[in-house]
């Protein structure tokens, strides 16, 4: 015989769910002892099974999962998977926060990315901050130029895709580039969308010989400028 | 060719639920967010909810909040609102429409293309 | 939430002359990254609405250059240099910046 255990603690480390109105929560708990445990879920302390809440709950005893679809702030509060067997019982908290403010397409931090200038084969930093209440995509774009051109005959930019990552709101992405040449000299952007839509900023990256003059050996390895 | 074709719209009584249907053709979907737009009969427009590209996050209008549910399966480039507790200010004509994709936009990043539209009439 | 406000309400036009709509944001829809989201849309009769002009100024494909977006801020105006007769039908300004995202009321516009 076993008391409960978790056995994917891993999963349970996000206790605060911090989520939109309108979208969908699901907490997991995901046990196992001897005998079988089984799983009660408690809201603010009570006995939880959802019958007040427009929309019901969905119990998935096998996945030891809680689901409320559509959340409104009424549902806000502190969810407890209790999982207990003849043996003892083990009991972990969430807490749900829903959110009501108005998603906006995502906010770059001004002078972000900022132009700079390197040596050859230094390494550079680009930043970018974005601000978003939607979790933002986030691209790393260099602009290139295609049969001489760096414009489509749609009037576009030909572009070509560096990095690819999904952030928390308020992180700062960072693009690095290492051993930088000649090449990679150019137009950089940072292109964040999110569901309401799109924002991005560009920064220019200038690459200067190893033997320019007006580098000296004290000068940092990349210079930031306006 | 680009195209949004809605579906499942009706007449249902209040209190009541209907499921729209809109199938995506023409672009990468599962690379857009999508959106609900109604038109109440002879009214202006009213938007009425967004969904992510990968359906993570979802916006509602506050005369929806609760009641509707938007939802998507790229596996089949299709978009769902699943419309519960009907009511008769829910009549309208209910458009799909392409949000923003991911990637730079050559163009308007989104809200350029637009599904005929499918009519829901809640009565009693 | 933001409120569009559009005037006139209806306009009847002379065809071959200008023609102007108005749409007043309730709060800035200049956003950090230097771009206005308006959006303009004509909707004319049993159709879906069909984009004119995106992020205040553009015209979307396909557009004739008659139509034309101006504006800053929360002050925006669609132009149509020399009205036609295909021209009439309703047309709607659309805030693009945040949800929930919000329309004018309308404008309907005919032809004399």
């Known amino acids: 015989q076993q008391a409960p255990y978790w056995t994917h603690p891993q999963r349970m480390e996000k206790k605060l769910h911090a989520v939109p109105a309108g979208n969908t929560v699901k907490f997991r708990c995901p046990a196992a002892g001897n005998p079988t445990p089984t799983i009660r879920w408690l809201k603010d302390g009570q006995a939880f099974h959802g019958e007040n809440r427009i929309g019901g709950i969905r119990l998935r005893h096998q996945h030891w999962s809680l689901v409320m679809e559509s959340v409104v702030p009424s549902d806000r509060g502190t969810y407890t998977c209790l999982v207990e067997n003849a043996v003892g019982s083990i009991r972990y908290n969430y807490l749900l926060d829903v959110l009501e403010r108005s998603p906006h397409r995502p906010i770059l931090q001004a002078g972000l990315p900022a132009n700079t200038t390197a040596v050859v084969g230094s390494d550079v930093e680009l930043l970018c901050k974005v601000y978003s209440d939607a979790q933002p995509h986030i691209q790393w774009l260099k602009h290139i130029v295609i049969n001489g051109s760096s414009f489509g005959a749609d009037g576009f930019p030909y572009v070509q895709v560096l990095k690819t990552a999904d952030i928390n709101s308020s992180e700062v992405e960072v693009l690095y580039l290492r051993n930088v040449s000649a090449e990679d000299a150019g137009e950089y952007t940072c292109l964040a969308g999110n569901s309401i839509g799109l924002s991005y900023q560009s920064a220019w990256l200038t690459v200067l010989p190893e033997e320019d003059p007006t580098w000296t050996a004290a000068a940092p390895e990349a210079r930031y400028t306006d | 060719e680009v195209q949004l074709l809605e579906s499942g719209g009706g007449v249902v009584q209040p209190g009541r639920s209907l499921r729209l249907s809109c199938a995506a053709s023409?672009?990468?979907?599962?690379?857009?967010?999508m959106h609900w737009v109604r038109q109440a009969p002879g009214k202006g427009l009213e938007w009425v909810a967004v969904?992510?590209?990968?359906?993570?996050?979802?916006y509602y209008a506050d005369s929806v909040k609760g009641r509707f549910t938007i939802s998507r399966d790229n596996s089949k480039n299709t978009l769902s609102l699943q419309m519960n507790s009907l009511r008769v200010e829910d009549t309208a004509i209910y458009y799909c429409?392409?949000?923003?994709?991911?990637?730079?936009?050559?163009?308007?990043?989104?809200?350029?293309?637009w599904g005929q539209g499918t009519m829901v009439t809640v009565s009693s | 939430d933001i409120v569009m406000t559009q005037t006139p309400l209806s306009l009847s036009v002379t065809p071959g002359q200008p023609a102007s709509i108005s749409c007043t944001s309730s709060?800035?829809?200049?956003?950090?990254?230097?771009?206005?989201?308006v959006y303009w849309y004509v909707q004319k009769s049993g159709q879906p609405p069909q984009l004119l002009i995106y992020?205040?100024?553009n015209r979307f494909s396909g557009v004739p250059d008659r139509f034309s977006g101006s504006g800053s801020r929360t002050d925006f105006t669609l132009k149509i240099s020399r009205v036609e007769a295909e021209d009439v039908g309703v047309y709607y300004c659309?805030?693009?910046?945040?949800?929930?995202?919000?329309f004018g009321g309308g404008t309907k516009v005919e032809i004399k």
């Open positions: 429409v392409r949000g923003a994709g991911l990637g730079y936009p050559n163009g308007p990043d989104g809200f350029d293309i």
């Open positions: 023409g672009f990468t979907f599962s690379s857009y967010a």
């Open positions: 969904i992510s590209y990968d359906g993570s996050n979802k």
């Open positions: 709060r800035s829809l200049l956003h950090s990254d230097g771009k206005t989201y």
């Open positions: 992020e205040l100024s």
């Open positions: 659309m805030q693009y910046i945040e949800a929930p995202l919000t």
